[in-house]
């Protein structure tokens, strides 16, 4: 769940000297207070995991460890967002969620945790080198991404502990602007409480918390995102070999390693226009309600602020033309 | 075990279409995660990414030339066909079609390539 | 668009000695720990032939000799003790964003 912190709630001031400008002086600097405690480094964190009762089902759960507002979460397979890999599913907070095969079902778990079951039967399984990743796009820390894979046992239910992104990318030049706001507002913040030092604190309700609790609240979004914040990154070394993807696993395997049946009916949908664009490398922050972003490298279907999630009949042809022309 | 095959026209003339055909077998587009990219390389020069195309039919052009490319694929044929528009002397060299697997965004099984030259 | 940079341009090595190549790259190409860079060796008249994926997972087939390494932007293949057959241009490539883009290429020499 997002983590906020809650601003105690102040008793009006009592008439006299302060009045309505003192009121201001008062609320204002925990105001600020609440901003300086959520606004820490935002990360992503990534886990993937085969399933112990199917084993050819995997589940990848991502989450954002910030307390903006997440726009939009994208889960690629192969690499990064954008890097010419495979969209697995899209989830828009308000627009719904999209999915693509071998993607089985993908939801949100929290207001800031996805989670996505991907149907691997054989072929089409993830080997311990495949990474997944997710990229969540927020307001204001824009946009973050993280990556993970299997974990090199192949035991069913074991999983790789959830993997953080220390060295994210903010893809909004904005972010430093929104940051030197932050910086300024606290240090007014440290002379507004400097004035007040030797004035009566302002009297708290007693049902609310402490100032204190804020920041123990902020810094610590639940125990499973604090475990995630610390898990040192581990090498994954496999013996999972591109040139003999096709045939048996090397020292055996799971037994999920079989050849895939192939579908020669499947047609799978082209990601939705609202879903195929992802978030450019650089640039200012585009509001998702403004038609999206193009990605260089892609032939993107059209895009513009009214668009559905209904699948385009045209199917995977839809991301044909340039810069959505058709 | 899989082999990859390139097979094209040789030799064209500027302003032409280059049309290039890449012929598999040992591994199949209807498989989840399977893509087959190109890349290309001018005699005694480096290699050029120019395009890749999945299973499901997503594609992806290398900037730079994206405007000229068009790839393809025909599953049942197991073949993935790549077209180039308004060639010029610089488009001559050899191109590779590469297997791409596991949704990985390597090359892991390359063709011999096919030579392609372009003379006035 | 990340510019890959390998060198030297080319090197000659004594047979049973250590070759190191570089690549870096003009950006940097990992993300959480998985660096999304490739090695390749070609020999004359051959298709380029994949050695390493994410940086330091040999590849199928590839001898033991062969090792990769590196993360964000510095990565090195070694090649040790080099043999007769090494002798080939090694080139680097990344996937971390499109376009994918190739190092220049080492070509080795065996002395």
């Known amino acids: 769940m997002r983590t906020e912190a809650q601003v105690p709630a102040l008793q009006p001031p009592e008439p006299g000297l302060e009045g309505a400008m003192g009121h201001r002086t008062l609320v204002l600097p925990w105001v600020l207070l609440t901003l300086c405690v959520t606004a820490g480094t935002p990360e992503v964190w990534v886990q993937v995991r085969m399933e112990a009762t199917e084993l050819s089902s995997f589940t990848i759960r991502c989450g954002f460890l910030g307390s903006g507002s997440i726009s939009l979460v994208t889960v690629s397979w192969g690499g990064p967002n954008g890097a010419g890999g495979t969209t697995l599913a899209v989830l828009h907070p308000e627009r719904g969620i999209r999915q693509w095969a071998p993607a089985r079902q993908a939801r949100w778990e929290t207001q800031s945790s996805i989670s996505l079951i991907l149907e691997g039967s054989g072929a089409s399984s993830p080997c311990a080198n495949t990474t997944f990743c997710c990229k969540f796009a927020s307001f204001p820390e824009g946009s973050w991404e993280a990556c993970g894979s299997l974990p090199p046992s192949s035991d069913p239910g074991l999983s790789a502990p959830p993997t953080p992104a220390p060295i994210l990318r903010a893809d909004l030049a904005g972010i430093l602007g929104v940051s030197g706001v932050l910086l300024f507002g606290c240090v007014y913040l440290l002379h507004l409480l400097r004035r007040h030092k030797h004035r009566p604190a302002p009297r708290l309700q007693p049902s609310r918390t402490s100032p204190q609790a804020p920041r123990a609240r902020a810094w610590a979004p639940s125990q499973a995102s604090q475990a995630a914040l610390h898990v040192p990154y581990a090498t994954i070394n496999t013996s999972c070999r591109p040139a003999t993807l096709d045939t048996a696993h090397p020292h055996g395997g799971p037994s999920w390693w079989a050849s895939l049946p192939t579908h020669a009916a499947h047609r799978p949908q082209g990601p939705a226009a609202w879903a195929s664009t992802p978030i450019p490398a650089r640039g200012s922050f585009v509001s998702v309600e403004n038609g999206l972003y193009a990605q260089a490298g892609e032939r993107p279907p059209h895009t513009g602020p009214g668009l559905t999630l209904f699948p385009d009949p045209r199917g995977p042809r839809a991301m044909e033309g340039p810069l959505g022309v058709r | 075990q899989v082999t990859l095959k390139e097979s094209g026209p040789g030799i064209l003339q500027p302003s032409q279409t280059l049309s290039l055909t890449c012929s598999f077998s040992?591994?199949?587009?209807?498989?989840?995660?399977?893509?087959v990219g190109w890349i290309r390389q001018p005699s005694g020069k480096g290699l050029e990414w120019l395009t890749h195309i999945w299973w499901n039919d997503n594609k992806f052009y290398n900037t730079f030339l994206k405007s000229r490319l068009t790839i393809s694929k025909e599953t049942s044929n197991n073949q993935v066909f790549l077209k180039i528009a308004s060639v010029d002397t610089a488009d001559a060299a050899t191109y590779y079609c590469a297997r791409m697997a596991y949704g990985n965004l390597w090359f892991v099984n390359w063709g011999q390539g096919t030579l392609v030259a372009v003379s006035t | 668009d990340i510019v890959l940079t390998q060198s030297p341009a080319s090197l000659a090595v004594s047979l049973g000695q250590r070759a190191s190549i570089s690549c870096r790259a003009s950006r940097s190409v990992t993300i959480s720990g998985y660096s999304y860079m490739y090695w390749y060796q070609q020999k004359p008249g051959q298709p380029p032939r994949l050695l390493f994926y994410?940086?330091?997972n040999l590849a199928s087939g590839v001898p033991a000799r062969f090792s990769g390494s590196g993360s964000g932007t510095d990565f090195t293949l070694n090649i040790h003790p080099v043999e007769e057959e090494d002798a080939a241009i090694y080139y680097c490539?990344?996937?971390?964003?499109?376009?994918?883009?190739f190092g220049g290429g080492t070509k080795l020499e065996i002395k």
């Open positions: 040992g591994f199949s587009l209807n498989t989840s995660g399977t893509g």
């Open positions: 490539q990344h996937s971390r964003e499109l376009p994918y883009t």
């Open positions: 994410l940086a330091s």
